[in-house]
């Protein structure tokens, strides 16, 4: 059974956060996707969407975030800039496929962001500003206001075992680990 | 330690497919990409695609589209990289490399298969 | 596609040189690039990701800098075993792409 993760990453305020989401090409490659944050006891947020139908390697930016959807490659980029102490949370990528309820992507993000600014440029890729430009016209998408019942979730167990969902055969796995972007070994 | 060993050279006519496998060893195979990268003989580097060996979802460039198909089998951290409709000009030597974290936008490759040589001749 | 034109595509210096190489994007990449040594017959070993930071265990005379379009590799005093091909690669945008690449010879 393919393991519905969480991975943690560990920013400083200002930092960028820069995750990528990937899906069934052939399914969704054209199908709107929204960037959600879930907070415990309540139905994911939608913070911002790709339009509908999704536009090929098309940057949306909706405040602090990016989504580009590059359904050529079957990967959806989420860029959050300038990160603040209250981004700090559990985020997940979905796909909208109304009448049908979203389909929920991997991974989740276990995002914290902590005050101060470690390290000057060159001691890490984290510790760089960057500074995105995006053109202007750029567009921000209406998301569908919708959520359903089942898409409200809970934390993640304390304990390290597989918790079996047979009807989506999936396993949420808690990964305890942190990530500081980029992490190869 | 962390590697990636691939399968061995190939010969084979154009018009046909190959596939060339790359195990995983010594990390978690599941939380990383693996990238397919190719080198024609005295030529430079030219990615091909990636996938996720955990959702086994995977992309590949446009020209190869329609021809490369990535499979895994995590069982044996294992994944597959099959080229079809094969010419003369994709003779090369076929790379697998461990990318980032899946979730990361990080596209380094710091771990390489020993590369596998793909002969296509009539 | 961004292009990734690396100059100049080869060079010979002697030991102890500084080398110098350098990998421009055809559009601005902030700070998405790595680079890759690759000796004959081997894989690509990397050396420098996110432009300038340098992974594990490869020696402190690699380095890095530039962000946007200009990107510079330089070794600092150029050993026998550097003798190699150099790559820069960026993952700013889909697709992936990598320089020409740069042969570095010993005089």
């Known amino acids: 059974a393919t393991k519905l993760t969480e991975e943690k990453y560990e920013l400083k305020e200002g930092q960028t956060l820069d995750v990528k989401c990937d899906y069934t090409l052939e399914k969704f490659a054209s199908s709107q996707k929204a960037w959600q944050i879930i907070r415990d006891g309540e139905m994911p947020k939608t913070l911002a969407c790709t339009e509908r139908p999704s536009k090929n390697s098309h940057p949306v930016q909706v405040g602090r975030i990016i989504l580009e959807d590059y359904h050529d490659h079957g990967l959806l980029r989420v860029r959050m800039v300038n990160l603040q102490v209250e981004d700090s949370g559990l985020y997940q990528c979905v796909i909208y496929q109304p009448p049908k309820e979203p389909h929920m992507l991997f991974d989740r993000i276990r995002l914290v962001v902590t005050k101060g600014f470690s390290g000057t440029p060159g001691s890490n890729e984290n510790s760089t500003q960057n500074v995105y430009k995006i053109p202007p016209t750029t567009t921000k998408a209406l998301c569908p206001l919708y959520t359903s019942p089942r898409t409200v979730t809970q934390a993640p167990p304390k304990s390290t075992a597989d918790v079996s969902t047979p009807d989506s055969e999936i396993n949420l796995t808690n990964v305890t680990d942190i990530i500081r972007v980029p992490v190869f070994n | 330690q962390v590697q990636l060993v691939q399968s061995g050279a190939e010969v084979t006519k154009p018009g046909a497919s190959v596939k060339v496998s790359c195990k995983a060893s010594?990390?978690?195979?599941?939380?990383?990409?693996i990238n397919w990268v190719r080198q024609a003989t005295g030529q430079g580097l030219e990615w091909m695609g990636w996938?996720?060996?955990?959702?086994?979802?995977?992309g590949s460039v446009q020209k190869f589209r329609g021809r490369v198909t990535m499979t895994r089998n995590t069982s044996i951290t294992t994944v597959y990289m099959e080229l079809s409709s094969l010419r003369s000009d994709d003779t090369a030597v076929y790379y697998c490399?461990?990318?980032?974290?899946?979730?990361?936008?990080?596209?380094?490759?710091?771990?390489w298969g020993q590369g596998t040589m793909v002969t296509v001749s009539s | 596609d961004i292009q990734m034109t690396q100059s100049p595509s080869s060079l010979s210096a002697s030991v102890g040189d500084r080398v110098t190489i350098t990998c421009q994007a055809s559009q601005d990449i902030n700070n998405h690039l790595n680079w890759y040594q690759q000796k004959p017959g081997k894989a690509p070993k990397l050396l420098i990701y996110?432009?300038?930071t340098l992974e594990t265990g490869v020696p402190s005379r690699f380095s890095g800098s530039g962000s946007g379009t200009d990107f510079t590799f330089t070794i600092s005093s150029l050993q026998p075993e550097d003798i190699a091909t150099y790559y820069c690669?960026?993952?700013?945008?889909?697709?992936?792409?990598f320089g020409g690449g740069t042969k570095v010879e010993i005089k």
């Open positions: 996938m996720n060996p955990n959702s086994g979802n995977s």
């Open positions: 996110g432009a300038y």
């Open positions: 010594g990390y978690t195979f599941t939380r990383y990409d």
């Open positions: 690669q960026q993952y700013d945008k889909l697709p992936l792409t």
């Open positions: 490399a461990r990318g980032g974290i899946s979730s990361s936008w990080h596209w380094a490759f710091d771990i």
